[in-house]
């Protein structure tokens, strides 16, 4: 049994880091493998993560963490029984993938303005809470070419757009994702999408 692709890990900078790797053949990850991880910190102990299958030869492990600070470094040991398959380390602050925003809501009752709001996925005491910026994706269910991205570079988890920038009388969907420049993070996953019917009063044409 050998590791084909070494574990790579990303942290949500809150409570979970996810590590993925590939074995050289079909593997029952949860019964055959264990990923031991330990914070490099005085009087810390090793903790065990039981991996799950992620495709035939792929494994994924969700490492529980109390919290994360920039200096944190973890040792990682991948075991198959008594055999050490791989040894490495992981610094969560250098591999951050933020949590996806939630509760995306489209408010259509504000004159001819669409107000999109969502929730910051972090509690106020988390460092990322005040460092997230967002991308909002809006697309038409009827027209695949009608696909747009709005970058929200301010901290407020909301976006206002004129309803007239979208076509009237058709359904749209929106989703939002987050990233943090301070840690050069990857983008989060997209939030679940929300749907609304776009309708607004056409301005009366003057002749």
């Amino acid at each position: 049994m050998k590791v084909l692709q070494e574990p790579t890990c990303v942290s949500d900078y809150m409570s979970i880091s996810t590590c993925e790797w590939k074995m050289n053949g079909p593997t029952n990850c949860s019964t055959e493998l264990r990923l031991l991880y330990q914070l490099v910190f005085l009087l810390s102990e090793a903790h065990t993560c039981i991996p799950e299958n992620n495709g035939g030869a792929g494994c994924v492990c969700h490492l529980l963490m109390d919290d994360v600070v920039s200096a944190d470094n973890y040792t990682l040991d991948l075991w198959a029984g008594q055999q050490l398959l791989w040894k490495g380390s992981f610094k969560p602050s250098e591999h951050v993938k933020p949590r996806a925003p939630g509760n995306l809501t489209v408010h259509t009752n504000v004159s001819d303005t669409l107000l999109l709001t969502w929730s910051n996925p972090y509690p106020p005491d988390n460092y990322l809470y005040n460092h997230l910026t967002y991308a909002v994706n809006i697309w038409s269910e009827n027209d695949p070419a009608d696909f747009r991205i709005y970058n929200v570079t301010y901290l407020e988890p909301s976006l206002r757009i004129a309803a007239s920038t979208l076509k009237s009388g058709i359904s749209y969907r929106a989703r939002v994702r987050a990233w943090a420049q301070c840690y050069n993070t990857t983008w989060s996953e997209w939030s679940p999408s929300t749907k609304w019917h776009n309708s607004y009063r056409e301005p009366f044409e003057q002749h």
Epitope: L43, H47, M65, D66
Partner: antibody, heavy 125, light 112 residues
Framework: EVQLVESGGGLVQPGGSLRLSCAVS????????MSWVRQAPGKGLEWVSS????????YYADSVKGRFTISRDNSKNTVYLQMNSLRAEDTAVYYC??????????????????WGQGTTVTVSS | DIVMTQSPLSLPVTAGAPASISCRSS???????????LDWYMQKPGQSPQLLIY???NRASGVPDRFSGSGSGTDFTLKISRVEAEDVGVYYC?????????FGQGTKVEIK
């Protein structure tokens, strides 16, 4: 009520051995690291050794490394200090102390918040 | 290894007066989680040491509020706002950031 009771001290000749015990009650023993600290007559405090709650992490002062062994039996709520090749400079009162919570991913520290009454070790010919 | 230096080593004080003990470490005790791994202990004559302050400024359970700890990084202070007769003893600072844990030399507080 938290209690730590040391025992096993005594008079021993240089080169001899002693095993100190620290029996604990009043808290979830296996969750906490434990430490030994000593105090030579008329001197200050000197850290000797520490062990994590699960026993997997062990640390020693350079002055005792290779001669002393810390261990614990979580089923008996007891931490031990095996002292071999004892020297005159090991003469001291030995205290055990409750250290940080070590079963969490990041150990939680609240100081050495409980200490035993101490046991006296005298190394002399 | 981290070295802890206390001053003064002897502190005669009038009952009811304030007292202050300084502790300096040879390297920063501030970890990136925001905590200073610096404790203060008191040892009364003939007794075991007892914890007064942990993580720089947190008073241990049952410790009177006349005791306070302050400082960050390498410089720390223990203050007793009004010294009482029962405060007589030796006070130690200790770093718990890394092993070997290191104690200061101790400061002997006595009533004038």
């Amino acid at each position: 009520e938290v209690q730590l009771v040391e025992s096993g001290g005594g008079l021993v000749q240089p080169g001899g051995s002693l095993r100190l015990s620290c029996a604990v009650s009043g808290f979830t023993f296996s969750s906490y690291a434990m430490s030994w600290v000593r105090q030579a007559p008329g001197k200050g405090l000197e850290w000797v050794s520490s062990i994590t709650g699960g026993g997997g992490g062990i640390y020693y002062a350079d002055s005792v490394k290779g001669r002393f062994t810390i261990s614990r039996d979580n089923s008996k709520n007891t931490v031990y200090l095996q002292m071999n090749s004892l020297r005159a400079e090991d003469t001291a009162v030995y205290y055990c102390a409750k250290d940080r919570i070590s079963i969490t991913i990041r150990p939680r520290y609240f100081g050495l918040d409980f200490w035993g009454q101490g046991t006296t070790v005298t190394v002399s010919s | 290894d981290i070295v802890m230096t206390q001053s003064p080593l002897s502190l005669p004080v009038t009952a009811g007066a304030p007292a202050s003990i300084s502790c300096r470490s040879s390297q920063s005790l501030l970890y990136s989680n925001g905590y200073n791994y610096l404790d203060w202990y008191m040892q009364k004559p003939g007794q075991s040491p007892q914890l007064l302050i942990y993580l720089g400024s947190n008073r241990a359970s049952g410790v009177p509020d006349r005791f306070s700890g302050s400082g960050s990084g390498t410089d720390f202070t223990l203050k007793i706002s009004r010294v009482e007769a029962e405060d007589v003893g030796v006070y130690y600072c200790m770093q718990a950031l890394e092993t070997p844990y290191a104690f200061g030399q101790g400061t002997k507080v006595e009533i004038k």
